[in-house]
Amino acid sequence: MNGRVDYLVTEEEINLTRGPSGLGFNIVGGTDQQYVSNDSGIYVSRIKENGAAALDGRLQEGDKILSVNGQDLKNLLHQDAVDLFRNAGYAVSLRVQHRLQVQNGPIGHRGEGDPSGIPIFMVLVPVFALTMVAAWAFMRYRQQL
């Protein structure tokens, strides 16, 4: 039996400067080449060693690229997305979605999961912090009596 797989989804703007050998990553996806089931988005499949993306350090394999220089990547054919990157110029601004996988319950396979699920630690950490603050405040209050 597998535990539920949750994701912490964050977005980031990444500005890359094209290096001598380009931007330095591979992509998969597109309307004609779905990489993630029911999602025709464009995903980073490989970061090339010593390339511009690797040296910058923020772009990760598995990231979804939402836009390039403000141009949305929704509903694009794979080759059209490739061409968009290749013609993006020297300074390239990427809007990227990172998905940090959080495993709840027994360890299972890495599935597509529910990207909108709230990881349990997102609930437990604030509750624990509030408990600690309340305990500290109570102790201080007792000392004053």
Epitope: L23, F25, N26, Q33, Y35, R46, E49, Q79
Partner: nanobody, 127 residues
Framework: HVQLVESGGRLVQAGGSLRLSCAAS????????MGWFRQAPGKEREFTAH????????NYADSVKGRFTISRDNAKNTVYLQMNSLKPEDTAVYYC?????????????????????WGQGTQVTVS
């Protein structure tokens, strides 16, 4: 992880033909870009041919253009290199290589550093 196994290499006479095969397993084949490289004794590994995920885009080293043809069968998870009008200088170990996805950079297909997965190679000898 991707495993690549080449086959089809053998001794052939000059002017003859051969078809090399590379069977891939371990990951969705349709997302892999594939290349053939070769390495002659005492020389560096050199680019021979490349095919993209769909088979819609191919390119070749100048030395094999018009003689070699790269193709793929996504239903069989296999890429082929049809070699015609073979010359003694085509003698080499031929390696199949794969990388996940398309590079967003131009002219990267010929760079061996652009590939993550490699087969063990198959020997082609042209006498």
């Amino acid at each position: 992880h991707v495993q690549l196994v080449e086959s089809g290499g053998r001794l052939v006479q000059a002017g003859g033909s051969l078809r090399l095969s590379c069977a891939a397993s371990g990951r969705t084949f349709t997302h892999l870009n594939m290349g053939w490289f070769r390495q002659a004794p005492g020389k560096e590994r050199e680019f021979t041919a490349h095919i993209n995920w769909s088979g819609g885009s191919t390119n070749y080293a100048d030395s094999v253009k018009g003689r070699f043809t790269i193709s793929r069968d996504n239903a069989k998870n296999t890429v082929y290199l049809q070699m015609n009008s073979l010359k003694p200088e085509d003698t080499a170990v031929y390696y199949c290589a794969a990388t996940l996805g398309d590079s967003v950079d131009l002219d990267s297909d010929a760079d061996p550093r652009g590939y993550d997965y490699w087969g063990q190679g198959t020997q082609v000898t042209v006498s």
